[in-house]
Every structure is written in structure tokens, then in C-alpha cells.
């Protein structure tokens, strides 16, 4: 079941998923001047069985000016390595050895993809928030939102996070840190 809405927006924060639940869709969008190849899928889909999950379909972009081209534009590993922009790196930020049953990792970048990735999440997905440059969190442990089904409708839980300018004093000067197990997965991920 797809979540009806996007995860909540938190002022001065960004969110990312650690892994994507099966059923998640990622739009195949291209940057300006490029378009999806004619035979290409409009999205990638996280699918799998009990032991392995992966993204079905491959996003491919081609120049809007080029006609009747079937040129393969998925970059080779060496090309991918050379095209490490900050934008690409940030998209790959969570794509390491996190391995969750029934989940896909962050898909690698494709050539000429749009600057922003648009995901369509499914019920049970958790996303995590982090304050952006120049802001710090008043709640300083992991901040998360989960897509839940309630009374036949989907909703995202509200992350307990406020990001404040670094120069502003914290409202919670004596706040204790909740200690997380560094080697295990976040509780919300293991309990699923």
C-alpha cells in the first residue's frame, strides 16, 4: 500500500531512508535537456523475495535533441566514479552495507538524472531526519517518521525534531542522550 502523502517537512531539516521497503517506487526523471528513453520505464520498483530485494527496471535518460537513439546511457562503474558530484554523493550517502530483509538499498545514480529524487513510499517505511547546514537539533537523538495505516488511511508520524540556528541557545541544556546500539539496526527497523 502506497503512502498517500510525502513525509512531513521539518523546517531546516532534510530526510533520508536507510533502506526502501519492497513496493517503493522511484521516478525515472531526467535533468533539463534530457528525457526518459522511449522504451524506458517511468519508475524503478523495489521488489524481491524473502532472501533478496533489488530495484526492477533501470532508469535511462537521453538527450531531448537526439532522435531515434537507443544509446545505452547507464554509466559504467569507472564513469560513475568520475562523476562524483556532491549531489550524487549525498544521494549515495546511505547506500553502504545496511542489509534489511524486504528492503532495497539506495539505487546508484544514473547518467543525467534529475537533481532531486522522488520516491513513492509504502506503509511501514521509516525515514530519518537531520538538521541542515547551520542548524542544530533540540532533540538530538535519531529523529524519524513512519508511514502507518490507520482506519484505512495512511499517515506519517510526526518526527520529534526542531532545528534551531547554531547561535540560539538550546531549550534543553541538561538533556541526556539516549544511547543507541552502534552495531545493530535502529529499533524501528529491527522490530518490523
Amino acid at each position: 500500500e502506497l503512502c498517500d502523502d510525502d513525509p512531513p517537512k521539518i523546517t531546516h531539516a532534510t530526510f533520508k531512508a536507510v533502506a526502501y521497503k519492497e513496493g517503493t517506487m522511484l521516478n525515472c526523471e531526467c535533468k533539463r535537456g534530457f528525457r526518459r528513453i522511449k522504451s524506458g520505464s517511468p519508475y524503478m520498483l523495489c521488489t524481491g523475495n524473502s532472501s533478496h530485494s533489488s530495484w526492477d527496471n533501470q532508469c535511462q535518460c537521453t538527450s531531448s535533441a537526439a532522435r531515434n537513439t537507443t544509446k545505452q546511457v547507464t554509466p559504467q562503474p569507472e564513469e560513475q566514479k568520475e562523476r562524483k558530484t556532491t549531489e550524487m554523493q549525498s544521494q549515495m550517502q546511505l547506500a553502504d552495507q545496511v542489509s534489511l530483509p524486504g528492503h532495497c538499498r539506495e539505487p546508484p545514480p544514473w547518467e543525467n538524472e534529475a537533481t532531486e529524487r522522488i520516491y513513492h513510499f509504502v506503509v511501514g517505511q521509516t525515514v530519518y531526519y537531520q538538521c541542515v547546514q547551520g542548524y542544530r537539533a533540540l532533540h538530538r537523538g535519531p529523529a524519524e517518521s513512519v508511514c502507518k495505516m490507520t482506519h484505512g488511511k495512511t499517515r506519517w508520524t510526526q518526527p520529534q525534531l526542531i532545528c534551531t540556528g547554531e547561535t540560539e541557545p538550546s531549550q534543553f541544556p541538561g538533556e541526556e542522550e539516549p544511547q543507541a546500539s552502534p552495531d545493530g539496526l535502529p529499533e524501528s527497523e529491527t522490530s518490523r
Epitope: A13, T14, F15, K16, V18, T86, Q89, S90, Q93, L94, A95, D96, Q97, V98, Y128, Y129, Q130, C131, V132, Q133, Y135, R136, A137, H139, R140, G141, P142, A143, E144, L161, C163, E177, P178, Q179, A180, P182, D183, L185, P186
Partner: nanobody, 127 residues
Framework: EVQLVESGGGLVQAGGSLRLSCAAS????????MGWFRQAPGKEREFVAA????????PYADSVKGRFTISRDNTQNTVYLQMNSLKPEDTATYYC????????????????????WGQGTQVTVSS
Amino acid sequence: EVQLVESGGGLVQAGGSLRLSCAASGRAFSMYNMGWFRQAPGKEREFVAATGWSGANTPYADSVKGRFTISRDNTQNTVYLQMNSLKPEDTATYYCAADSIRLRSDVTRIPLEYDYWGQGTQVTVSS
């Protein structure tokens, strides 16, 4: 458990550049905030730069802003510190550290909040 190993230190003339690397072993590297700190003889360990797990937050100490750049490559489990326009006052042992709270919602500059530390690499800037 996360193990961190720094490399890339050395002797360089003022105005020169160095690139420090910190290789991490252990699971889920990309879910940790990572930081660089330095300690000169007889001084306290001080914050240099850090990078959030989300890539959205890279604070720097005022003394290195515009000269140092922190970056990370999660495919290689490595954090880098590119140091340009080095000054004699940058001379210190540089340490890489990993925050103990995974997916922490901000990036801390406080050494005590980093539980995993490397052994350090010496940087000497001569005038």
C-alpha cells in the same frame, strides 16, 4: 564496533596542502556522523570539521573555514579532510572520530560525544 585508521599526515611548508584519509571498518558507516579533531602538544583536543550522515551538515571550526574541506565516500567507508593554505598553527595530531549515536539529527562538535577514535596522524607545517 567501528575501527578508524587515519593516514595522509606529514611535513609540509606553510601555504602547502595535505589530504588526510580516515578508513573505517564496521557496519553501517553511512549512518554515523564523522568528525576530524586535532590536538597540539600541551593543548586540548579541538574540533576541526564534521560531516553528517545525511550529507546535509558539514560544520567547520572558524580557524579552518575556507581552507579545509571535509568529505566522505560511503562506498569506500572513508572520510577525507582536504587541507589547503596550511599555516604553522595547524601543526597537530589529527584524529578521525565517529559519533556513537547513529542517525543523530544534528552534527556535534563536542569530542566527548564521539565514541570511536582513530590513533591519529601527525601534521607538521613549517614556516
